[in-house]
Amino acid sequence: MNSFNYTTPDYGHYDDKDTLDLNTPVDKTSNTLRVPDILALVIFAVVFLVGVLGNALVVWVTAFEAKRTINAIWFLNLAVADFLSCLALPILFTSIVQHHHWPFGGAACSILPSLILLNMYASILLLATISADRFLLVFKPIWCQNFRGAGLAWIACAVAWGLALLLTIPSFLYRVVREEYFPPKVLCGVDYSHDKRRERAVAIVRLVLGFLWPLLTLTICYTFILLRTWSRRATRSTKTLKVVVAVVASFFIFWLPYQVTGIMMSFLEPSSPTFLLLNKLDSLCVSFAYINCCINPIIYVVAGQGFQGRLRKSLPSLLRNVLTEESVVRESKSFTRSTVDTMAQKTQAV
């Protein structure tokens, strides 16, 4: 019924300079993508390739060990969160290529863009759980010897996933498709209609629960851990610090643009120039956040090479050593052998 070529629009239009002469058609619908969108497409493509392959490999390596190895449980869940988010990328990629036209329907609009938010919350909650685990290993080694088991780890992961789903619901509910009259285009986005306060509330909750609060707690948590481990001669290592900083910092660095633009847009009028500028950068911010979905496997490999000192080791074997090594629960050594586990703090969100 609607036989439009969305990739190469060809529509006459009234001059947007608000001239009084509406008799002159102006074809200003550009066939070329904006620079931020092109950058977003490049990032999406790289993230998809690395994220799908890397996380699939991590899932494969950790799945066999997840029944008995707690670290494997953490990494398995993080990889699943990332892998799920990467599956939405071809759809988002296609939409940007078609000038943000969304031909996939209302259900896909609600579900697919929400995956990256689910990933954000799942990852940060899993990171919080992993951080708590690392903290307990250092400060409560006896408790860990008695109670730290695979069953409890799975329960903690289930709670993290449940909370993540709960926190994703508002964005899921407010996602709608809007079909524009001219040029003909179906857009997928959030619509709060008149309720600007609700929009702000969602943005603030996302910023606090998905960014600021985790930033604060992880910073405090790892400050204590590092202070304790540095006080022991055997574990004093700049490499440990670098890994911890890389893992935690990357999560917050890649989420920062999305969170900042999101909060700003919720306080701006949709017709304001700043809002329109930020809206043009939206895809780029999302793609930047999506880097979180592929960076964990990269960190694991880099760290694995560093700690194993075997650059020629096969990738699955290298990952297995990094991801499934069980922490030794002796206070003086608790951080030494499980340093790489802290990479689980690196999480992805949107």
Epitope: Y11, Y181, D191
Partner: antibody, heavy 116, light 112 residues
């Protein structure tokens, strides 16, 4: 100047079909949508849909998708609307109007009366 | 569909008075381009509607400057600074941001 000249009034029986025309002049016919609007007696305006002569794109309001069929003849710069299976509720004035933005130019309207 | 709610439905005025018609949409009318496609039409008895104001506040060619439009997002207003005899008729607001294009129920401007 832009002109939209519509065909004359129609008196039809329930269940029949009617086809009305809208001859456009004074602008490049293929550059703009041709929209159609219904106005029942003493009531507001209802958008039926548009036809885009440039690429044959057509869009109907959900309410009219089984009632109206929009076509154009580019060679004569004329737009057509056919209404099917007419009922008494279809009695109204039907306007063609140049679209793609605000409806800046309208035809004079075609009165359709459905009567047994 | 976007519902356009016009108030009042009838507006009795005296010639020379100022008149104000309100139009509220059920959703934001801001287009992805940043434009707001809210327009005002006047229909006199036995005539086709005529475009007065397009994109919230722009007067169409030939429309006197006593007509002005304002608003943003979901709330819009048409003002006539000094009502003249030729201004009497039914005023419709309309949005062409989203499909389907929708119109308000109309406001009849009549003499007291």
């Amino acid at each position: 100047q832009v002109q939209l000249q519509q065909s004359g009034p129609e008196l039809v029986k329930p269940g029949e079909s009617v086809k009305m025309s809208c001859k456009a002049s004074g602008y490049t016919f293929t550059d703009y949508y041709m929209d159609w609007v219904k106005q029942s007696h003493g009531k507001s305006l209802e958008w039926i849909g548009y036809f885009y002569p440039n690429n044959g794109g057509v869009k109907y309001s959900q309410k009219f998708k089984d009632k109206a069929a929009l076509t154009v003849d580019k060679s004569s710069t004329t737009a057509y609307m056919e209404l099917h299976s007419l009922t008494f509720e279809d009695s109204a004035v039907y306007y063609c109007t140049r679209g793609s933005g605000p409806f800046a130019y309208w035809g004079q309207g075609t009165l359709v009366t459905v009567s047994a | 569909d976007i519902v356009m709610t016009q108030t009042p439905l009838s507006l009795p005025v005296s010639l020379g008075d100022q008149a104000s018609i309100s139009c509220r949409s059920s959703q934001s009318l801001v287009h992805s381009s940043g434009n707001t496609y809210l327009h005002w039409y006047l229909q006199k008895p036995g005539q086709s509607p005529k475009l007065l104001i397009y994109k919230v506040s722009n007067r169409f060619s030939g429309v006197p400057d006593r007509f002005s439009g304002s608003g943003s997002g979901t709330d819009f207003t048409l003002r006539i600074s000094r009502v003249a005899a030729e201004d009497l008729g039914v005023y419709f607001c309309s949005q062409s941001t989203l499909v389907p294009v929708t119109f308000g129920a109309g406001t009849e401007l009549e003499l007291k």
